[in-house]
C-alpha cells in the first residue's frame, strides 16, 4: 500500500574539523521511494555540486573537505507524492584549530613611544592569545597589554624592551605559534662628553674629545668654523653603543669646533652639537722647510682676494719666494684690466689662489690646490670668450714671461672636491651671487662642505712650481 | 667641435642588461667628467651617475648603485652605462652630458631603451 | 640625498608676460644651481650657471637669483620660443639633483 514519507532518524547537530568529512544521515520510509533533497541555509544543494556526495537514495549527504564557510543549518525534504512533503534539520558546526592570520613583524621603534605588535588569529572555539618574549611567557602589566584583538600594545618603550617576541593562539583543538619578531628599541644621540675650549699657542698640538651615545650608534662629524673639518686627525672607538671621538688638530689659527653626534631613524635623522673655542695666546714665526714654507701673506696685490692673515705657501725652489710669487701675479694681472666685469673679480680669485696656494702647516708644509670645480668654472663659465684668447696667447709664447704659465691652472688636473673635499680650496666668490655684494668677499680657508661619497680620494704628485693632481 | 655621439635605441626584455656607449670628439677626453641622465616618457630629468674618464671612478645616484656600471675607454675616447635587472620603469631616454654644473656642459642626442616582455 | 622642490609643476602664460619658477634645495646648497630648458624632442640647453650668471648665448630676459636653499628662475617678457620645460639642477655634491621640472604653456 502507498505510505506518506516518514523520517525515522532526524538529523543533528554535526561537529567536524576543517578538511575534514561531515556527514548527515536522513533516514525515510514510504512507499514509493521518495525523492529527497537537501538545502544549506535554505538554499537547494545541487546533485552535481562535486564538493558533496549524496548517497544511499538521497539519504546520506557528505560533505568532502570542511571548509569554514560550511557552517550553517542543513536540511532534508521527503517527498513521494502521498501526503505531505517532510523535513528534518540539523547544524554544522565547523571547528577550527588556531591560526594566525596576521602575524607580528620587525618593528623599530623610538624609545617613548607606542609600539604595536600585531596578532590576529582564527578559530572555533576562539582561541585565546599569549606572547613570548625570548624563551619566557610575557608578563602583562601598565605599559604591557595584550589586546582583545591578539595584538601586543608597548607604551612608553623602554630599551629593555627590545627583544625577540612570537604570539601563540590556543584553543581546545591545539595551538600555534606565530615567527619570531624583533623589537629594535632606537635612541636619540645625545653626547655624554662636550669637547673642551682650549687658548694655545700657534703651532701647537691640541685634542679635542667628543663621546656620544646612542642606538643605532651614532656617527661624529666635526666642523670647523662652519665647514667640515678639513685639516687635523680624528681616531674614533665605538664601546657598548658609545662612540667617542678625538681630535688632533696643528693650530696656525683661531677656531670654533664643533663635535656633531647623528643618527639615523627611518628616513629621519637626530642630531647632538657640542663646540668649543680654540684662541691662540701668541703667534710664533713659521718654521722653513726644503720645499716651501706656510706664511701669512704679506703682498699687495692678492690683499682684496686672500683672506686677512692668510696662510699661503711660499715655494722656495725660488731665491725670493715671496717677490717672485707676487711678480707672477702682478704680470697675469695685468692682463685681466681688459676682461669683462663678470670675468675679472672670478680671474683674480682663481689666479691669487693658483700661485698663493692655501697652505696646510704641518710636519711637511702642504699647498692645496685649487678644486677643479672652481677651476672650470672661472675658465668655462664666467672668463669662456678671455680664456680662449689666454690660452691662445700662452701657446703661442706672446707673453712676456715664461713665468706666466704658471697663472694657468690646467683644470683636469686639480683634486674635485665632490671626490675629495680636503684635498683643494674653493673659490668663495663663487659662493656669493652678484646681487648680494658691492664687493667680493675675501678668499677663505675652508674647505667645501660637501658630501663625500665613498671613493678613492685625490693622490697628489710632489709639489713643483704649478703641480699637478690625478684622480686615481 | 666638441661632439658626444651615443649609440642607438635598444629593446629589452625585464630582467635583461643594456649597454649605452658615448663616444666624445672635439676635446681632450681625459680633462673632462661625464654624467649619465635620464629622462623616462613624459617624465622629468634624472640623474644617474659620474665618471672620470681618466682613471674611471665613478659615482652613482643610491637609487642604481649596485644596478649600474659605468665605463671608460681611453683608447677610443668612449665611455658606457651599463644598466642591469632591467624593469619596465626603466624604459626611457638615456643621455650622456659633459660637466653639468661646472664647466661648458654638451649633451649627447640620447639613446632610447624600451624594457618590454 | 640633496631634494630639489620645483613650483609650479605647470603654468600657463601669455606672451609679454613676467613669469618666475622657484626651486627649493632641502639644505643649502650654496650657490651651485643651474637651470636648464628642454623643448619637446630636444636635449636640455643650460640658461643659468651658478644661480645668477646668464649662460653666453642666452637671452637677457633670462636671469637666476637666491642663494642657500631658495632660487628662482625669472622670464621677464614671455617671447614664443619660451614655452618649454624648465629644470633645476644642483651640483654642490654628488649625487647631483635635478628638480622634477615646470612646464611652461600658451595660456
Known amino acids: 500500500l502507498p505510505k506518506a514519507p516518514v523520517i525515522t532518524t532526524p538529523l543533528e547537530t554535526v561537529d567536524a574539523l576543517v578538511e575534514e568529512v561531515a556527514t548527515f544521515m536522513c533516514a525515510v520510509e514510504s512507499y514509493p521511494q521518495p525523492e529527497i533533497s537537501w538545502t544549506r541555509n535554505k538554499i537547494l544543494i545541487k546533485l552535481f555540486d562535486t564538493r558533496y556526495s549524496i548517497r544511499e537514495n538521497g539519504q546520506l549527504l557528505t560533505i568532502l573537505s570542511v571548509e569554514d564557510s560550511d557552517d550553517g543549518i542543513y536540511c532534508c525534504t521527503a517527498n513521494n507524492g502521498v501526503g505531505g512533503a517532510v523535513e528534518s534539520c540539523g547544524a554544522l558546526q565547523v571547528k577550527m584549530k588556531p591560526k594566525i592570520t596576521r602575524p607580528p613583524i620587525n618593528v623599530k621603534i623610538i624609545e617613548g613611544l607606542k609600539a604595536v605588535l600585531p596578532c590576529t588569529t582564527m578559530g572555533n572555539p576562539k582561541p585565546s592569545v599569549s606572547w613570548i618574549k625570548g624563551d619566557s611567557p610575557l608578563r602583562e602589566n601598565s605599559r604591557i597589554a595584550v589586546l582583545e584583538s591578539g595584538s601586543l600594545r608597548i607604551h612608553n618603550v623602554q630599551k629593555e624592551d627590545a627583544g625577540q617576541y612570537r604570539c601563540v593562539a590556543k584553543n581546545s583543538l591545539g595551538t600555534a605559534y606565530s615567527k619570531v619578531v624583533k623589537l629594535e628599541v632606537e635612541v636619540f644621540a645625545r653626547i655624554l662628553r662636550a669637547p673642551e675650549s682650549h687658548n694655545v699657542t700657534f703651532g701647537s698640538f691640541v685634542t679635542l674629545h667628543c663621546t656620544a651615545t646612542g642606538i643605532p650608534v651614532p656617527t661624529i662629524t666635526w666642523i670647523e668654523n662652519g665647514n667640515a673639518v678639513s685639516s687635523g686627525s680624528i681616531q674614533e672607538s665605538v664601546k657598548d653603543r658609545v662612540i667617542d671621538s678625538r681630535l688632533q688638530l696643528f693650530i696656525t689659527k683661531p677656531g670654533l669646533y664643533t663635535c656633531i653626534a647623528t643618527n639615523k631613524h627611518g628616513e629621519k635623522f637626530s642630531t647632538a652639537k657640542a663646540a668649543a673655542t680654540i684662541s691662540i695666546a701668541e703667534w710664533s714665526k713659521p718654521q722653513k722647510d726644503n720645499k716651501g714654507y706656510c706664511a701669512q701673506y704679506r703682498g699687495e696685490v692678492c690683499n682684496a682676494v686672500l683672506a686677512k692673515d692668510a696662510l699661503v705657501f711660499l715655494n722656495t725652489s725660488y731665491a725670493d719666494p715671496e717677490e717672485a710669487q707676487e711678480l707672477l701675479v702682478h704680470t697675469a694681472w695685468n692682463e685681466l684690466k681688459v676682461v669683462s666685469p663678470v670675468c675679472r673679480p672670478a680671474a683674480e680669485a682663481l689666479l691669487c689662489n693658483h700661485i698663493f696656494q692655501e697652505c696646510s702647516p704641518g710636519v711637511v708644509p702642504t699647498p692645496i690646490p685649487i678644486c677643479r670645480e672652481y677651476c672650470l668654472a672661472v675658465k668655462e663659465l664666467f672668463c669662456a670668450k678671455e680664456w680662449l684668447v689666454m690660452e691662445e696667447k700662452t701657446h703661442r709664447g706672446l707673453y712676456r714671461s715664461e713665468m706666466h704659465l704658471l697663472s694657468v691652472p690646467e683644470c683636469s688636473k686639480l683634486p674635485s672636491m665632490h671626490w675629495d673635499p680636503t684635498a683643494c680650496a674653493r673659490l668663495p666668490h663663487l659662493d656669493y651671487n652678484k646681487e648680494n655684494l658691492k664687493t667680493f668677499p675675501p678668499m677663505t680657508s675652508s674647505k667645501p662642505s660637501v658630501d663625500i661619497p665613498n671613493l678613492p680620494s685625490s693622490s697628489s704628485s710632489s709639489f713643483s712650481v704649478s703641480p699637478t693632481y690625478s684622480m686615481t | 667641435q666638441v661632439q658626444l655621439v651615443q649609440s642607438g635605441a635598444e629593446v629589452k626584455k625585464p630582467g635583461a642588461s643594456v649597454k649605452v656607449s658615448c663616444k666624445a670628439s672635439?676635446?681632450?677626453?681625459?680633462?673632462?667628467?661625464m654624467h649619465w641622465v635620464r629622462q623616462a616618457p613624459g617624465q622629468g630629468l634624472e640623474w644617474m651617475g659620474i665618471?672620470?674618464?681618466?682613471?674611471?671612478?665613478?659615482s652613482y645616484a643610491q637609487k642604481f648603485q649596485g644596478r649600474v656600471s659605468m665605463t671608460s675607454d681611453t683608447s677610443t675616447s668612449t665611455v658606457s652605462m651599463e644598466l642591469s635587472s632591467l624593469r619596465s620603469e626603466d624604459t626611457a631616454i638615456y643621455y650622456c652630458?659633459?660637466?653639468?654644473?661646472?664647466?661648458?656642459?654638451?649633451w649627447g642626442q640620447g639613446t632610447l631603451v624600451t624594457v618590454s616582455s | 640625498d640633496i631634494q630639489m622642490t620645483q613650483s609650479p609643476s605647470a603654468m600657463s602664460a601669455s606672451v609679454g608676460d613676467r613669469v618666475t619658477i622657484t626651486c627649493r634645495a632641502s639644505?643649502?646648497?650654496?650657490?651651485?644651481l643651474a637651470w636648464f630648458q628642454q623643448k619637446p624632442g630636444k636635449v636640455p640647453k643650460r640658461l643659468i650657471y651658478i644661480a645668477s650668471n646668464l649662460q653666453s648665448g642666452v637671452p637677457s630676459r633670462f636671469s637666476g637669483s637666491g642663494s642657500g636653499t631658495e632660487f628662482t628662475l625669472t622670464i621677464s617678457s614671455l617671447q614664443p620660443e619660451d614655452f618649454a620645460t624648465y629644470y633645476c639642477?644642483?651640483?654642490?655634491?654628488?649625487?647631483?639633483?635635478f628638480g622634477q621640472g615646470t612646464k611652461l604653456e600658451i595660456k
Open positions: 652630458a659633459r660637466e653639468l654644473g661646472w664647466g661648458s656642459d654638451y
Open positions: 665618471i672620470n674618464p681618466s682613471g674611471g671612478s665613478t
Open positions: 672635439g676635446y681632450t677626453f681625459t680633462s673632462y667628467y
Open positions: 639644505q643649502d646648497i650654496r650657490n651651485y
Open positions: 639642477l644642483q651640483h654642490n655634491s654628488y649625487p647631483y639633483t
